[in-house]
């Protein structure tokens, strides 16, 4: 009976740091800590109410984190950046859709660079580094009334607590504002050894 | 000795729901249940023997689940849909390849919308919602004898038992029927808190 | 106290093969083994110092595994191939960027097939099988001074110890040599039942 009860606390959560927990405190502390340390994740969808204009590369700062498909756990979204709260190896991904319909008006140029850059910023060393990029040059001629293009990138990266992930795109005014179209996210896969 | 033996059952499977298991029944039940509750996954590859003929958006219902790279575990494939058997957060992905060779005949139009939509349907609320979309408008002119284009989408979503995942595409008759070309899948990453 | 200590060893590592460990040896062995068996992963970035020429399909053999974003753990990189050391189900991914600037000279043809193939080779059966492919035919006309295109593929596969993953591309001389542009990787998600 006693063994079973103790095991319930320990084994109940898949991702606890049991060794540390059991040395540092009581079984109750362990249970609390195991909950806090559940694997972090985020899936952020574009908030199109505040999309920058222009065709240059801009950082997208408006994302939803708690409506529709958007969600976050054990990570923080602040000032347009996804902040890591827990060291680990994470799979990062982004899906970015661009579209143009002739009813939106004429494009300034028919030759476009439609690009995404997923970047990491460290607070300690305040510089930004691109983790992943993708995209395409496109010729969106007036012969077609509608144009569409999507980019997907993904990769596995070591992230430290406090580091920030952000997304930059070119031609932000062409972004598709649907939650199924333009989003990015992360989920922790494993601890750092 | 006794403790060790009991632990073998409990810890042996990484993904057991130990708390529930230990309250509900014996160690033997726990071992059985731990096997049943192993992390679900699926990788489904296109079955091109029954591709719809239109150019409009259609749901693809013919997929392989047990040949070549295709496989499924703790999920169900039925009526063209991937059914979730275990609540959790899943990474979903799809790779869709379209191709055309001049020997296949003349395209009805050279301006194509090549798109994929990964959708979720809930039995309780019988409506379909698009989780992810991707694709591109393409101009596949007769100047080139061969055309090819691939789409990849992926994202992290909360799925409940009984929910169904399906894939819709435009221009299904242009799909590349190879198992390495057109597929979709899912794997569970973590439980819902 | 004794129970707690034993539990520390067992539960401390999320990904141990506890049953095997406890049968085969002492608690100390178990702790060591748990470290060795931590979930494998790799993220390899292109080493552009040795890119093949030509426009045909070639295997890319030069990748970084320990600089910048590149890293590897419990997998081996040898002779241009990523070697699996631990049976399991893995998520595999690749991101391949192609680019051309007019300052690089004229393209031999403006009609290009820009493709990636992620392949698996088994030492026991020395044949190569394509797990994933993606890409696009492109018309990179001289009207534009710069062209760019990226491909992303990903999927979930059963891999056995000793199997090798490699990446083939067409038009390798057009590859973008940046570490954020051209890379591939894998991470283990779960054991084989």
């Amino acid at each position: 009976g006693a063994v079973q009860k103790e095991l319930q606390h320990i084994v109940g959560s898949q991702h606890i740091r049991a060794e540390k927990a059991m040395v540092d405190g009581s079984w109750l502390d362990l249970a609390k800590r195991s909950k806090l340390e559940a694997q972090p994740f985020a899936h952020l969808t574009i908030n199109a109410t505040d999309i920058p204009t222009g065709s240059h590369k801009v950082s997208l700062s408006s994302w939803y984190h708690d409506r529709g498909w958007a969600k976050i756990s054990n990570m923080t979204f602040s000032n347009g950046k996804l902040i890591v709260n827990q060291d680990g190896f994470y799979y990062l991904y982004a899906n970015i859709c661009f579209r143009h319909h002739e009813t939106s008006g004429d494009l300034a140029t028919e030759y476009l660079q439609l690009m995404v850059y997923v970047t990491k910023t460290s607070i300690k060393i305040p510089s930004s580094h691109t983790l992943m990029k993708g995209g395409s040059t496109k010729y969106w001629s007036g012969n077609s009334e509608f144009h569409f293009y999507s980019i997907n990138v993904g990769g596995f990266f070591k992230l430290r607590s406090g580091e920030e992930i952000s997304v930059e795109v070119s031609n932000p005014s062409l972004l598709d504002p649907d939650q199924d179209a333009t989003y990015f996210g992360a989920f922790k896969v494993r601890d750092i050894d | 000795g006794a403790v060790q033996k009991e632990l073998q059952h409990i810890v042996g499977s990484q993904h057991i729901r130990a708390e529930k298991a230990m309250v509900d029944g014996s160690w033997l039940d726990l071992a059985k249940r731990s096997k049943l509750e192993a992390q679900p996954f699926a990788h489904l590859t296109i079955n091109a023997t029954d591709i719809p003929t239109g150019s409009h958006k259609v749901s693809l219902s013919s997929w392989y689940h047990d040949r070549g790279w295709a496989k499924i575990s703790n999920m169900t494939f039925s009526n063209g849909k991937l059914i979730v058997n275990q609540d959790g957060f899943y990474y979903l992905y799809a790779n869709i390849c379209f191709r055309h060779h001049e020997t296949s005949g003349d395209l009805a139009t050279e301006y194509l919308q090549l798109m994929v939509y990964v959708t979720k349907t809930s039995i309780k609320i019988p409506s379909s919602h698009t989780l992810m979309k991707g694709g591109s408008t393409k101009y596949w002119s007769g100047n080139s004898e061969f055309h090819f284009y691939s789409i990849n989408v992926g994202g992290f979503f909360k799925l409940r038992s009984g929910e169904e995942i399906s894939v819709e595409v435009s221009n299904p008759s242009l799909l590349d029927p190879d198992q390495d070309a057109t597929y979709f899948g899912a794997f569970k990453v973590r439980d819902i808190d | 106290g004794a129970v707690q200590k034993e539990l520390q060893h067992i539960v401390g590592s999320q990904h141990i093969r506890a049953e095997k460990a406890m049968v085969d040896g002492s608690w100390l062995d178990l702790a060591k083994r748990s470290k060795l068996e931590a979930q494998p992963f790799a993220h390899l970035t292109i080493n552009a110092t040795d890119i093949p020429t030509g426009s045909h399909k070639v295997s890319l053999s030069s990748w970084y595994h320990d600089r910048g974003w590149a890293k590897i753990s419990n997998m081996t990189f040898s002779n241009g191939k990523l070697i699996v050391n631990q049976d399991g189900f893995y998520y595999l991914y690749a991101n391949i960027c192609f680019r051309h600037h007019e300052t690089s000279g004229d393209l031999a043809t403006e009609y290009l097939q820009l493709m990636v193939y992620v392949t698996k080779t088994s030492i026991k059966i020395p044949s190569s099988h394509t797990l994933m492919k993606g890409g696009s035919t492109k018309y990179w006309s001289g009207n534009s001074e710069f062209h760019f295109y990226s491909i992303n593929v990903g999927g979930f596969f059963k891999l056995r110890s000793g199997e090798e993953i490699s990446v083939e591309v067409s038009n390798p001389s057009l590859l973008d040599p940046d570490q954020d542009a051209t890379y591939f990787g894998a991470f283990k998600v779960r054991d084989i039942d």
């Epitope: - | 150019s55 259609v58 139009t109 | -």
Partner: antibody, heavy 121, light 107 residues
Framework: QVQLVESGGGVVQPGRSLRLSCAAS????????MHWVRQAPGKGLEWVAV????????YYADSVKGRFTISRDNSKNTLYLQMNSLRAEDTAVYYC????????WGYGMDVWGQGTTVTVS | DIQMTQSPSTLSASVGDRVTITCRAS??????LAWYQQKPGKAPKLLIY???SLESGVPSRFSGSGSGTEFTLTISSLQPDDFATYYC?????????FGQGTKVEIK
């Protein structure tokens, strides 16, 4: 069920115009190319015109080129044939027919309407 | 323009007979050929497309073969419902042409 229903036929004098309609139901109209085929009394079948699923491409038989116009309204699931400068040899039963493939030409016509009669005299 | 020549123009046969109708194209059309059945006062019905593919719902006694310039429609065992006129139809370069038809009548 899948159905095509033609209307708009009738008797018309040479040189005049007529517009035929074809109402589609039971399938995704916007996903398929559509044809007009005619059959003069006691004669064989003659292909008249075709339009792609999105309306971007239209092709005509030499015998009607410049006089007939094929069009479609996907929001109304309706196909049209505007016939101008009608001649006596245009007298026929006019069928609308669905292309078997929406993406490719050449796969045949798998659904046909019952036809509407046009008499030019 | 590519011409389509069907033969024979009329064919008399009995129930249970094996019937073959031929269609010749004046130029190579690959396998872009379809076969239709039409009964008096009715719309045509697609039987075969791409020279040899059987349309859904069509009885398996109907089959098509050939490529290039010579094509055949075969009815392996003629049934009472099969007495009708049969048309071949070719596709080539955004143009469709029907053959003149073959009438299959009761002997």
């Amino acid at each position: 069920q899948v159905q095509l229903v033609e209307s708009g036929g009738g008797v018309v004098q040479p040189g005049r115009s007529l517009r035929l309609s074809c109402a589609a139901s039971g399938f995704t109209f916007s996903g398929y190319g559509m044809h007009w085929v005619r059959q003069a009394p006691g004669k064989g079948l003659e292909w008249v015109a075709v339009i792609s699923y999105d309306g971007t491409n239209k092709y005509y038989a030499d015998s009607v080129k410049g006089r007939f116009t094929i069009s479609r309204d996907n929001s109304k699931n309706t196909l049209y044939l505007q016939m101008n400068s009608l001649r006596a040899e245009d007298t026929a039963v006019y069928y609308c027919a669905k292309s078997l493939s929406g993406t490719y030409w050449g796969y045949g016509m798998d659904v046909w309407g019952q036809g509407t009669t046009v008499t030019v005299s | 323009d590519i011409q389509m020549t069907q033969s024979p123009s009329t064919l008399s046969a009995s129930v249970g007979d094996r019937v073959t109708i031929t269609c010749r194209a004046s130029q190579n059309i690959g396998n872009w050929l379809a076969w239709y059945q039409q009964k008096p006062g009715k719309a045509p019905k697609l039987l075969i497309y791409k020279a040899s593919s059987l349309e859904s719902g069509v009885p398996s006694r109907f089959s098509g073969s050939g490529s290039g310039t010579e094509f055949t429609l075969t009815i392996s065992s003629l049934q009472p419902d099969d007495f009708a006129t049969y048309y071949c139809q070719r596709y080539n370069s955004y143009s469709w042409t029907f053959g003149q038809g073959t009438k299959v009548e009761i002997k």
